[in-house]
Interface confidence: medium
């Protein structure tokens, strides 16, 4: 592998960074439109920090970090900076597969426990502006009622439940929308993981290939 | 035409829980919802709750919620009530109804009678 | 929960003279879509419910036409024209507009 190949690597890895820094900076601020506006509230109490606007930070700060990373480092031939790139995106991946397995194998647990904290969070709709800002925003969405239906409203549906009498709950909405898209995530995930382990091949070759160069002009 | 067929009889243990069955033949399983209803020797009827074919939207009749799950197979078109930590308030002839959508229940199983006694 | 409550409790009538069974709601049965949600239920005895009437009047597929339906709100109105021998059993009424559904109590029509 020459010059010519180092260099189309070089921007290659760039240009894509690039591409996923601007991608970043959307995401992020989406997110903190989202915390500004507050539109949809928080639906755990258990985990108050699980809020759409925040989900959508933490997604966007670590995109822009990472893809920081691999332009800078390939656009400055800096195998500091690649090696951090390539550290991240690894430990990224390993945090997916980890995830991935652990809802595989606790699937039960985490229905009863996000079941839970749904129930806990209706009866908190009357008392609380945010509990009430997210419940009205997801069953406007989803054109859902209730966690499995409406008669999960004891002193009656709120306004922002369909009219229809017999319509469907949004727990039970959201899982079957999961359900029945579950091979287009699971094409979206494996992508996802695709472009990982690109970004990690192509941060290593071009971290062999600094070495080679300098060695070869004799740095 | 449609059908919905329920077993006669079923005895059990005070404490112990049984599955209801309903089998549903001659319409679309999977476009009407199915009820669940609730008649003591000689009384009136109760609403225990309505389960959607997707199998997770449901109904309950606040009365029934630590009493009944109901739950739905739709590859052999069969929806079904599991009643726990039965006591003797608990015998009584259980029903299953197809809710036409627009409605409520047109179509009646003949019923399954549950006896709880030792 | 909406309370039926239904009248008479039972009902003693000779063949081919007029029934009118009573069914009082605790709130008014008219959904958002415009429609009442109630239903009329026929139980002979040792059968199992058949459902005569929804939406107030409309009557169901196969139910003579000697059964009638009427009322708004929260009062409605079984009524037969002609008894007959097969009508002999237990009516119900039932709202389906609010959860959890409820019924009425029930009335029981003897044959004189």
């Known amino acids: 592998m020459g010059m010519s190949s180092l260099k189309l690597l070089k921007y290659v890895l760039f240009f894509f960074n690039l591409l996923f820094w601007i991608c970043g900076c959307c995401i992020l601020g989406f997110g903190i439109y989202l915390l500004i506006h507050n539109n949809f509230g928080v639906l755990f109490h258990n985990l108050p920090s699980l809020t759409l606007g925040n989900v959508f930070v933490i997604v966007g700060s670590i995109i822009m970090v990472v893809a920081f990373l691999g332009c800078m480092g390939s656009i400055k031939e800096n195998k500091c900076l690649l090696m951090s790139f390539f550290i991240l995106l690894l430990i990224i991946l390993l945090a997916e597969v980890t995830l991935a397995i652990l809802l595989f194998v606790y699937e039960q647990k985490l229905n009863e426990y996000v079941a839970k904290g749904l129930t806990d969070s209706i009866h908190r709709y009357h008392s609380d502006n945010s509990t009430k800002a997210a419940w009205d925003s997801i069953q406007s969405f989803l054109q859902c009622c209730g966690i499995n239906g409406t008669s999960d409203w004891t002193s009656g549906p709120p306004a922002s439940c369909p009219s229809d009498r017999k319509v469907e709950g949004c727990y039970a909405k959201a899982r079957l929308w999961f359900h029945s898209n579950f091979l287009y995530i699971g094409i979206i995930t494996i992508c996802v993981c695709v472009i990982e382990v690109l970004g990690m091949s192509f941060a290593l070759t071009l971290n062999c290939q600094i070495d080679k160069t300098s060695q070869t002009i004799g740095l | 035409q449609v059908q919905l067929q329920q077993p006669g009889a079923e005895l059990v243990k005070p404490g112990a829980s049984v599955k209801l069955s309903c089998k549903a033949s001659?319409?679309?399983?999977?476009?009407?919802?199915m009820h669940w209803v609730k008649q003591r020797p000689g009384q009136g009827l109760e609403w225990i709750g309505m389960?959607?074919?997707?199998?997770?939207?449901?109904n309950y009749n606040g009365k029934f919620k630590n009493k009944a799950t109901l739950t739905i197979d739709n590859s052999s078109g069969t929806a079904y009530m599991q009643l726990s930590g039965l006591t003797s308030e608990d015998s009584a002839v259980y029903y299953c109804?197809?809710?036409?959508?627009?409605?409520?229940?047109?179509?009646w199983g003949q019923g399954t009678s549950v006896t709880v006694s030792s | 929960d909406v309370v039926m409550t239904q009248t008479p409790l039972s009902l003693s009538v000779t063949i081919g003279q007029p029934a009118s069974i009573s069914c009082k709601s605790s709130?008014?049965?008219?959904?958002?879509?415009?429609?009442?949600?109630l239903n009329w239920l026929q139980q002979r005895p040792g059968q199992s419910p058949k459902r005569l009437m929804y939406q107030v009047s409309k009557l169901d597929p196969g139910i003579p036409d000697r059964f009638s339906g009427s009322g708004s709100e929260t009062d409605f109105t079984l009524r037969i024209s002609r008894v007959e021998a097969e009508d002999l059993g237990v009516y119900y009424c039932l709202q389906g507009t609010y959860y959890p559904w409820t019924f009425g109590g029930g009335t029981k029509l003897e044959i004189k």
């Open positions: 001659g319409y679309t399983f999977t476009s009407c919802w």
């Open positions: 709130q008014s049965l008219l959904y958002s879509d415009g429609k009442t949600y």
């Open positions: 389960i959607h074919p997707n199998g997770y939207s449901s």
């Open positions: 109804a197809r809710d036409d959508y627009a409605e409520t229940m047109d179509y």
